[in-house]
Amino acid sequence: CKAMHVAQPAVVLASSRGIASFVCEYASPGKATEVRVTVLRQADSQVTEVCAATYMMGNELTFLDDSICTGTSSGNQVNLTIQGLRAMDTGLYICKVELMYPPPYYLGIGNGTQIYVIDPEPCPDSDF
């Protein structure tokens, strides 16, 4: 197994609808054909898995049906979108990339993207 560099933005602000998108780019040393991408959330020194997908190069990323993540791939870039975020979900989201095939196995872990989520203010009642 070998190490690999993974780049991702330092900070992303989620939309008012609780959607955050960022690009995860990995420095593939060769022509990988099977890639696994995992998003991890680190908060208070606890690391939890948010979502994961294995994809064959050239195909779409397929997350589980109940996943809060969607994504597309283009070359060595993965465009990730996380939905349904609330203020309590603010934290560091780490992109992990594994090159599963062909050998050797490579693992790359990004430095993380700090995603800030601000719950929208409720609309004030308006009198007409």
Epitope: C1, T33, E34, R36, T38, L40, V47, E49, A52, T54, M56, I94, K96, E98, M100, Y101, P102, Y105, L107, I109
Partner: nanobody, 119 residues
């Protein structure tokens, strides 16, 4: 806790066949590369074959065309079908799982099963 348990080893004559099976416990099977390695007396452990979660396979040159690896996600098993066995295939065969757990690379090994090819 992850455990890999092998079965199916034994004594077989040259030209014969054996099927090794490895059962994985723990939540790793769908995420890890599963493989078989072997170690003959006085030699280093070497890769025989492995299979990715997506079903891509990789074989050592010495077993290509004779051995076949497969995985069953429903049963959490990985099998190695060994045909046209030769005396030089004699070794202890180990099941292996390679992948990552959160931020760490992990590799797990079974206890091994003896395969002896002799007349």
């Amino acid at each position: 806790e992850v455990q890999l348990v092998e079965s199916g080893g034994g004594l077989v004559q040259p030209g014969g066949s054996l099927r090794l099976s490895c059962t994985a416990s723990g939540n790793i099977f769908s995420r890890y590369i599963m493989g078989w390695y072997r170690q003959a007396p006085g030699k280093q452990r070497e890769l025989v074959a492995d299979i990715t979660p997506g079903g891509n396979t990789n074989y050592a040159d010495s077993v290509k065309g004779r051995f076949s690896i497969s995985r069953d996600g429903a049963k959490n098993t990985v099998d190695l079908q060994m045909n046209s066995l030769r005396p030089e295939d004699t070794a202890v065969y180990y099941c292996n799982a390679l992948g990552s757990d959160k931020l760490l690379i992990r590799t797990y090994w079974g206890q091994g099963t003896q395969v002896t090819v002799s007349s």
